[in-house]
C-alpha cells in the first residue's frame, strides 16, 4: 500500500511540476522592469523566452517575438534547450509513469517491468526537474549580471548633453513558477525511484524439499502433483539457494499478487 | 460620441479649496486612465495628475502632491480633482483628458477646461 | 522631470509652404522593450482645448490630415505640415508619454506670412 501511495503521490507532484515548467516556459514574465529607484515610466517592459512585452498605463499590451534564432543571446538559447529538454523528457516520464503505476493493470505486465518503467520515469522526472532548475538559474544569473552593469551606468551620457535611461530588469514570476516546477519535478522523480525499489520483486525464500526414492531417480511430491522443486515442469534436481543466484536453466518462480502490499 | 465636461470652476481666494469634476460620457469611463492637466492664461500647458482606471496608481507632479488629489467614481462615470491651498499660480482652465488606448500614452479626447481663478 | 523644449517659438509659413517644428528632450523617448518613442503633438487653437494629432513620433492620429506628419527618434523630433492652410494656424505642442510627470514642451506658435 506504501509503495502505490509512494508511486502515486509521486507521479501527481511531477505531473503538477511539469505543467509549472511547461507554464514557466510559455510565460513572458521571465524578466520584468525594475520599477525601483527608478524614473516612473509611463509603460511596464516585461520579456520571456519567447518575446518581449510592453504594457502601457492604459492597459494596452503590445507583445513582439524574437523572430530571429541567430541574433539572439547565446545563453538564452541555452535557456530555451534547457527548458524543452526538461519538458520533453518530462513528457516521456509521465507516459512511461502512466505504464507503470501500480495501481493500472496493463494486461499481464509483471511486477519487475513496472518496477523498471517506475526507475526509469523516476529518473527522467530528476532530469527534467534539474534541466528546469538549471535553465531558469542560468537566466537569472544573467538577469543579475546585467542588472548590477546596468546600474554601473544608470545613466549614459550622450555627449555631455542628452541621457539616455537604462532600463534595468528583475526576476519576473516564470522564473519562480520555474524554481518551483522544477523543485516539485525532481521530488516525484525522487519518489518515483523510492517507489521502485518497494516495486522489485525480491527473490523467494521458499525452500522446494525433494523426496528421493530409494532406486529411482524422480523426485517424489505428495498429493499427485509431477516431481517437481518448483511451481513449473522441470524435474531436473536444483542446488537450493537461500536468495542468492539462479541456475542458469532454473524457471523463474513469479511471486503472485498477494506476496506484496 | 466621446463627450468629457469640466465643472466646478471659479473665483477663489488664496488658501481656499475647489473641487473640479470631469463628467464622461459616450466611451466605457471604467476602462479608461484619466488625466488632469492645466494651462494658465496665455502660457503652455502643464500636466497635473493621472489616475489609472482602477483608481490605482495614481501620479502627481511633485510641486502639486500633497495640495491636489484625484479620485474618480466609475460608477456614475467621474472624475475629480480636489484642490487644497490654493495659490494665485494655480490660476489657470483645468482641462481633464482621456488616456487614448493603443496610442502610446497620449490624450487623446481633452474637454472643453474649466476656468479657476485664484485672487483675493 | 523630463525637459521638452521646442523650437521656434514662434513660425510665420505662406499658404502652401513647409512648417517646420522641432522639440527636443532631455532624456531619450525611445522605449527599449519595444523600440518606440512615446512623443505625441497636439494642435490648439484659439479658445480650443488641445487636440492630438500624432502619437508614438510619427503615426497620425484618426481623422487627422496627412499633410502632418511626424518623425524623429530619441531624443529628436520633428512635426511637418507639408503644405500649410488657413486652418492650422495654431499652437502646436510636443509631449513625453514616457515618463511621468508627462511633461509638454512651451509650444510653438504658427501663423500664416
Known amino acids: 500500500m506504501a509503495v502505490t501511495a509512494c508511486q502515486g503521490l509521486g507521479f501527481v507532484v511531477s505531473l503538477i511540476g511539469i505543467a509549472g515548467i511547461i507554464a514557466a516556459t510559455c510565460m513572458d514574465q521571465w524578466s520584468t522592469q525594475d520599477l525601483y529607484n527608478n524614473p516612473v515610466t509611463a509603460v511596464f517592459n516585461y520579456q520571456g523566452l519567447w518575446r518581449s512585452c510592453v504594457r502601457e498605463s492604459s492597459g494596452f499590451t503590445e507583445c513582439r517575438g524574437y523572430f530571429t534564432l541567430l541574433g539572439l543571446p547565446a545563453m538564452l538559447q541555452a535557456v530555451r534547450a534547457l527548458m524543452i529538454v526538461g519538458i520533453v523528457l518530462g513528457a516521456i516520464g509521465l507516459l512511461v509513469s502512466i505504464f507503470a503505476l501500480k495501481c493500472i493493470r496493463i494486461g499481464s505486465m509483471e511486477d519487475s517491468a513496472k518496477a523498471n518503467m517506475t526507475l526509469t520515469s523516476g529518473i527522467m522526472f530528476i532530469v527534467s526537474g534539474l534541466c528546469a532548475i538549471a535553465g531558469v538559474s542560468v537566466f537569472a544569473n544573467m538577469l543579475v549580471t546585467n542588472f548590477w552593469m546596468s546600474t554601473a551606468n544608470m545613466y549614459t551620457g550622450m555627449g555631455g548633453m542628452v541621457q539616455t535611461v537604462q532600463t534595468r530588469y528583475t526576476f519576473g514570476a516564470a522564473l519562480f513558477v520555474g524554481w518551483v516546477a522544477g523543485g516539485l519535478t525532481l521530488i516525484g522523480g525522487v519518489m518515483m525511484c523510492i517507489a521502485c525499489r518497494g516495486l522489485a520483486p525480491e527473490e523467494t525464500n521458499y525452500k522446494a524439499v525433494s523426496y528421493h526414492a530409494s532406486g529411482h531417480s524422480v523426485a517424489y511430491k505428495p498429493g499427485g502433483f509431477k516431481a517437481s522443486t518448483g511451481f513449473g515442469s522441470n524435474t531436473k534436481n536444483k542446488k537450493i539457494y537461500d536468495g542468492g543466484a539462479r541456475t542458469e536453466d532454473e524457471v523463474q518462480s513469479y511471486p503472485s499478487k498477494h506476496d506484496y502490499v | 460620441e466621446v463627450q468629457l465636461v469640466e465643472s466646478g470652476g471659479g473665483l477663489v481666494q488664496p488658501g481656499g479649496s475647489l473641487r473640479l469634476s470631469c463628467a464622461a460620457s459616450?466611451?466605457?469611463?471604467?476602462?479608461?486612465?484619466m488625466h488632469w492637466v492645466r494651462q494658465a492664461p496665455g502660457k503652455g500647458l502643464e500636466w497635473v495628475a493621472y489616475?489609472?482606471?482602477?483608481?490605482?496608481?495614481?501620479y502627481y507632479v511633485d510641486k502639486l502632491k500633497g495640495r491636489f488629489t484625484v479620485s474618480r467614481d466609475n460608477a456614475k462615470n467621474s472624475l475629480y480633482l480636489q484642490m487644497n491651498s490654493l495659490r494665485a499660480e494655480d490660476t489657470a482652465v483645468y482641462y481633464c483628458?482621456?488616456?487614448?488606448?493603443?496610442?502610446?500614452?497620449?490624450?487623446?479626447?481633452w474637454g472643453q477646461g474649466t476656468l479657476v481663478t485664484v485672487s483675493s | 522631470d523630463i525637459v521638452m523644449t521646442q523650437s521656434p517659438d514662434s513660425l510665420a509659413v505662406s499658404l502652401g509652404e513647409r512648417a517646420t517644428i522641432n522639440c527636443k528632450s532631455s532624456?531619450?523617448?525611445?522605449?527599449?522593450?519595444?523600440?518606440?518613442?512615446?512623443l505625441a503633438w497636439y494642435q490648439q487653437k484659439p479658445g480650443q482645448p488641445p487636440k492630438l494629432l500624432i502619437y508614438?513620433?510619427?503615426t497620425r492620429e484618426s481623422g487627422v490630415p496627412d499633410r502632418f506628419s511626424g518623425s524623429g527618434s530619441g531624443t529628436d523630433f520633428t512635426l511637418t505640415i507639408s503644405s500649410l492652410q488657413a486652418e492650422d494656424v495654431a499652437v502646436y505642442f510636443c509631449?513625453?508619454?514616457?515618463?511621468?510627470?508627462?511633461?509638454f514642451g512651451g509650444g510653438t506658435k504658427v501663423e500664416i506670412k
Open positions: 508614438g513620433a510619427s
Open positions: 489616475i489609472s482606471s482602477g483608481s490605482s496608481p495614481i
Open positions: 509631449q513625453n508619454d514616457l515618463f511621468y510627470p508627462l511633461t
Open positions: 459616450g466611451f466605457t469611463f471604467s476602462s479608461f486612465g
Open positions: 532624456q531619450s523617448l525611445l522605449n527599449v522593450g519595444n523600440q518606440k518613442n512615446y
Open positions: 483628458a482621456r488616456a487614448g488606448y493603443a496610442v502610446r500614452n497620449a490624450l487623446d479626447y
